[in-house]
Structure formats: structure tokens, C-alpha cells
Interface confidence: medium
């Protein structure tokens, strides 16, 4: 298993509509023609998966149907959202890359991009 | 209360087949990574296998690769390895465990026992 | 594969002892390092993770510290239950691989 550097924002702040974007960007040292990238949530000791797709260089990225995630890739880097966030969600979401084929595999892990989600406050009602 | 109970052991011939599972509850299975790990009478603890929790990564000990098959089965919250074409080293007791990545495995199953013997 | 050498193989201890077991990783591995605790037919029990982090619900007499290639888990003063036999764990890539072990018994 060789290592592969990711990078990949310190901060994204979520949308009022729960929706946070952000770039996970490999430095691939390999022509890879098959990458898988996960996303990881840890809080406190608990590391878990939001959501995984595997795609070929030059596809769209495909996530399963029921996933909160969606997201394209261009080059080295993929576009990775994520809807339907509150504020309990609030976390570190780790970028997980690893390049599938052809060998060698390799793997790289981001440092994180720590996500803030505010709950919008229930509008008043109004006249108007 | 996170419980996990592995079922499926016994006593297989050499060359012969088994089929583990590992029932979860207590916590969101399809979020979590699983492992697989071992340990032969009076010996120390090997790691077997592990999946990912959409199931879309699969990872082995070169001991095992192409004989064992890690699976999980997310609308059933279990956890499987099927064993092929044994032999008496992989005669252990066999363990599930929650596995958190890179933090390691913060709850195991009471596991079950292999044993392979003619 | 990184290769995980865990010293002693064995120990004997009182009640009361400070009590020191090392691991040492044949590559660096950040602080992606467990210790585990095994009683004789039961399963292991997570005590550290992430080199030093104590496990909820473990006595504070337990500690891990290293970094990189060398780990070290100490218990500050031996209890009659911490008998057993420890193991780490590296976590930071497959295959994933286990020290060999150290039993503690009574002195």
C-alpha cells in the first residue's frame, strides 16, 4: 500500500439549506484508471462513512441512490457536496482517495475539512 | 448497547468451506467499517479482513486472500466471511469487530470457533 | 507490511507495580496506534486509541504515549485485574497487524 497526499479545505460553512461543498485533490502518481473516494465523518472517537463512489477517469462520480452525497471530478480533483446537513452533523469529514487500478494501489487520506452547520431560524410569522 | 454475535463455526475437513456471520445492533452498521480477526489456540491476535461500510471497499491478510470473502449485508446488519479451501492453520477463534479506522475497534464480538481437522 | 515488535513477550508484576510494554512499528505510522487488553477466553478490549486517547470507561491508571515508530502503554500502579495479556495494533494501513503480545502475570 503506497501513500498518496490529499488535500482539501481546513473550514467549509454549510449553506442555510444544509448543503456543504467542498474539493478533495489527490496528487496521483500513477495513471490510475479507477478511483474510489469515501467520505468520512469523525467526531469525537468515532470515525464513520457518509458516503462512497468508485468511477472511472473521465466519468461522473456515481454515489447510491439513498446518499446525501453528490459530486463530479475533473483531473485530480473531485467536487464533493453533501445535503441535508444539520447542526448535530457538524464534524470532520475526511477525504479518502484511493486509486484501484491499475496497480499499484495506492491510498491517501485528507487532513479533513471541518464543516459547520447552523440550523436556520424558524421564520416569524408575518403579515406579509 | 452495541452487541456483536458471531454464529457459523465449527468443525470443518481440510479443503472444506464455512460460512461466518455476525449480527450487529445497537449502533448504525452501514456507517461503520467491520473487521474480521483471529486468534489460534494459545497464540496471538491476527487481523483477517475488514470491509467498508457501504461494503465498496474490501481489504485481506495475505494469509487468507483468495480463500476468504468478507461481505456485509446492510438491510440485515450482518457481517460475513466466507471461508473456502481451509486448512489447519486457519483453525482459531474467529472475532468480528467494529472497526473506526485509522481509532481501531471499540467493541468485539465473544467470537467462535474454527477448527479445521480430518 | 508494517511489522509491529511488542517487548516483553512476558512480564511479572506485583500489586502495586508501575508497568511499561513497548511497541515499535517498522515504518512511521502518525499516532495510528491501539492497545488492547485479553483475558483468558474472552475478547479483547480496546484501553488506548489514537497513541494516547484513553477508552471511555478505562481506569486513568492507564496511559499510552509515541508517535511515528515507538509506543509505549503504561500502567501507573498494577491492579489484581489488570492481569492479562496486551496487545497493540497498528491502524494506519491494511493489512492491518497486532504486536505479538505481553502476558503479565503475578510475581
Known amino acids: 500500500c503506497k501513500a498518496m497526499h490529499v488535500a482539501q479545505p481546513a473550514v467549509v460553512l454549510a449553506s442555510s439549506r444544509g448543503i456543504a461543498s467542498f474539493v478533495c485533490e489527490y496528487a496521483s502518481p500513477g495513471k490510475a484508471t479507477e478511483v474510489r473516494v469515501t467520505v468520512l465523518r469523525q467526531a469525537d472517537s468515532q470515525v464513520t462513512e457518509v458516503c462512497a463512489a468508485t468511477y472511472m477517469m473521465g466519468n461522473e462520480l456515481t454515489f447510491l441512490d439513498d446518499s446525501i452525497c453528490t459530486g463530479t471530478s475533473s483531473g485530480n480533483q473531485v467536487n464533493l457536496t453533501i445535503q441535508g446537513l444539520r447542526a448535530m452533523d457538524t464534524g470532520l469529514y475526511i477525504c479518502k482517495v484511493e486509486l484501484m487500478y491499475p496497480p499499484p494501489y495506492y491510498l491517501g487520506i485528507g487532513n479533513g475539512t471541518q464543516i459547520y452547520v447552523i440550523d436556520p431560524e424558524p421564520c416569524p410569522d408575518s403579515d406579509f | 448497547e452495541v452487541q456483536l454475535v458471531e454464529s457459523g463455526g465449527g468443525l470443518v475437513q481440510p479443503g472444506g468451506s464455512l460460512r461466518l456471520s455476525c449480527a450487529a445492533s445497537g449502533f448504525t452498521f452501514s456507517n461503520y467499517a467491520m473487521s474480521w480477526v483471529r486468534q489460534a489456540p494459545g497464540k496471538g491476535l491476527e487481523w483477517v479482513s475488514a470491509i467498508s461500510g457501504g461494503g465498496l471497499s474490501t481489504y485481506y491478510a495475505d494469509s487468507v486472500k483468495g480463500r476468504f470473502t468478507i461481505s456485509r449485508d446492510n438491510s440485515k446488519n450482518t457481517l460475513y466471511l466466507q471461508m473456502n479451501s481451509l486448512r489447519a492453520e486457519d483453525t482459531a477463534v474467529y472475532y468480528c469487530?467494529?472497526?473506526?479506522?485509522?481509532?481501531?475497534?471499540?467493541?468485539w464480538g465473544q467470537g467462535t470457533l474454527v477448527t479445521v481437522s480430518s | 507490511d508494517i511489522q509491529m515488535t511488542q517487548s516483553p513477550s512476558s512480564l511479572s508484576a506485583s500489586v502495586g507495580d508501575r508497568v511499561t510494554i513497548t511497541c515499535r512499528a517498522s515504518?512511521?505510522?502518525?499516532?495510528?496506534l491501539g492497545w488492547y487488553q485479553q483475558k483468558p477466553g474472552k475478547a479483547p478490549k480496546r484501553l488506548i486509541y489514537a497513541a494516547s486517547s484513553l477508552q471511555s470507561g478505562v481506569p486513568p491508571r492507564f496511559s499510552g504515549s509515541g508517535s511515528g515508530t515507538e509506543f509505549t502503554l503504561t500502567i501507573s500502579s498494577l491492579q489484581p485485574e489488570d492481569f492479562a495479556t496486551y496487545y497493540c495494533l497498528q491502524h494506519n494501513s491494511y493489512p492491518l497487524t497486532f504486536g505479538g503480545g505481553t502476558k503479565v502475570e503475578i510475581k
Open positions: 469487530a467494529k472497526d473506526l479506522l485509522w481509532l481501531g475497534f471499540d467493541y
Open positions: 515504518q512511521a505510522i502518525r499516532n495510528d
